[in-house]
């Protein structure tokens, strides 16, 4: 899987998993959120060479093609596959409130 | 959505669908397909600025990041969402096959 | 510049529902509450809830809990608020207004240019 | 729910005057070294304004005439020298509790 375990301990030029810690106020402009300040993102990037991790059968008819077509345009791309919640805590006035945002963290990718 | 309806009749520089026709034999090396010849595969291509058809939270999160941050290299990416399957003729030996090929073809884009 | 530019008055029957749009641009959609407030003629200022558009977060003023519904559109920037079995007493003008952003609740810098809703049989 | 009482509920006052609106929270709205407390102006037909935010702070765009002091409960806006386009009705705003509440608005009347 193009997870943490793999991906932060490898240098890989191909799609994998990439380190982003986002800051809510400087990153984001969401002053409002009280804890946490900012949270492990992370996202996905890098190249889909033919069979890497591709996700549909799609994906891998166009990886091949693109291997065969090298002028094409059209590649599969890395993009997020496993995602897991955020949980908040913010003010309503005095009152504090805890809210769960979902799909706030990628955990693992895919090309697709 | 951004689907063909949508894409194939506007000039589109962002995430859409973009017309793909692969001939089997000659795009993908594959001569044991008998029918059809080819399929229109389609592809999702374009850029994924600010809240163009974001697909989950983080990608929201990370199209406003990219906005925030445009020297950030994290931004979401044009891919597919609704794919179709495909059927196709083949032999085995002089026994014709029909099969159903899940996720050949793609309907629609999103940003993820 | 910021700007806050809404739906066209409305009359409905008792009961009905109104959906009022908010259309924002000159500044990040995403990163600010959206308020709605209500003002009845002749009279005060009535907070009915928010929405944070990048999350679908809301807050809703239990005196209209049940009865509205806020949402966004973030593709276009638009903020709506739907008011379900109206009653004459919702004829009011209906405001949206951006929270200046420290906290969820807030005090609101830009306002839209509002939206009569007569409720009338 | 907190209360929000204005005091006067109207006024009448010439151009040049000192002008003070009183508001008064049926709790504290202190929090954190903050007052939640805001005041807008509202002419007729027209939506609600900004002027001050936090108890004190004036709005960017908004003459220096206007100023907000107060803590705790009670607040107040003053308006040093009134001009023909302060004429308005003024409401203050607390954000201390949920539900977000106004008080009654006060009408500000040439004499």
């Known amino acids: 899987a193009l997870d943490a375990a793999y991906c932060f301990r490898n240098v890989q030029d191909n799609c994998c998993l990439r380190p982003l810690y986002i800051d809510f106020k400087r990153d984001l402009g969401w002053k409002w959120i009280h804890e946490p300040k900012g949270y492990n993102a992370n996202f996905c990037a890098g190249a889909c060479p033919y069979l890497w991790s591709s996700d549909t059968q799609h994906s891998r008819v166009l990886s091949l093609y693109n291997t065969i077509n090298p002028e094409a345009s059209a590649s599969p791309c890395c993009v997020s596959q496993d995602l897991e919640p955020l949980t908040i805590l913010y003010y309503i006035g005095k009152t504090p409130k805890i809210e769960q945002l979902s799909n706030m963290i990628v955990k693992s990718c895919k090309c697709s | 959505a951004l689907d063909a309806a949508y894409c194939f009749r506007n000039v589109q520089d962002n995430c859409c669908l973009r017309p793909l026709y692969i001939d089997f034999k000659r795009d993908l090396g594959w001569k044991w397909i008998h029918e059809p010849k080819g399929y229109n595969a389609n592809f999702c291509a374009g850029a994924c600025p600010y809240l163009w058809s974001s697909d989950t939270q983080h990608s929201r999160v990370l199209s406003l990041y990219n906005t925030i941050n445009p020297e950030a290299s994290a931004s979401p990416c044009c891919v597919s969402q609704d794919l179709e399957p495909l059927t196709i003729l083949y032999y085995i030996g002089k026994t014709p096959k029909i099969e159903q090929l899940s996720n050949m073809i793609v309907k629609s884009c999103k940003c993820s | 510049q910021v700007q806050l530019v809404q739906s066209g008055a409305e009359v409905k029957k008792p009961g009905a529902s109104v959906k009022v749009s908010c259309k924002a641009s000159g500044y990040t959609f995403t990163s600010y509450w959206m308020n709605w407030v209500r003002q009845a003629p002749g009279q005060g200022l009535e907070w009915m809830g928010q929405?944070?558009?990048?999350?679908?977060?809301?807050n809703y003023n239990e005196m209209f809990e049940g009865r509205v519904t806020m949402t966004t559109d973030t593709s276009t920037s638009t903020a709506y608020m739907e008011l379900r079995s109206l009653r004459s007493d919702d004829t009011a003008v209906y405001y949206c207004?951006?929270?200046?952003?420290?906290?969820?609740?807030?005090?609101?810098?830009?306002w839209g240019q509002g939206t009569l809703v007569t409720v009338s049989s | 729910d907190i209360q929000m009482t204005q005091s006067p509920s109207s006024l009448s006052a010439s151009v040049g005057d000192r002008v003070t609106i009183t508001c008064r929270a049926s709790e504290s709205v202190d929090w954190y070294g903050n007052s939640f407390m805001h005041w807008y102006q509202q002419k007729p037909g027209k939506a609600p304004k900004l002027l001050i935010y936090?108890?004190?702070n004036l709005e960017s765009g908004v003459p220096s005439r206007f100023s907000g002091s107060g803590s705790g409960t009670d607040f107040t806006l003053t308006i040093s020298s009134l001009q023909p386009e302060d004429f308005a009705t003024y409401y203050c705003q607390q954000n201390a509790e949920d539900p977000l509440t106004f008080g009654g608005g006060t009408k500000v009347e040439i004499k």
């Open positions: 929405i944070f558009p990048a999350l679908g977060s809301t």
């Open positions: 207004a951006r929270g200046i952003g420290n906290y969820a609740l807030d005090a609101m810098d830009y």
């Open positions: 936090y108890a004190s």
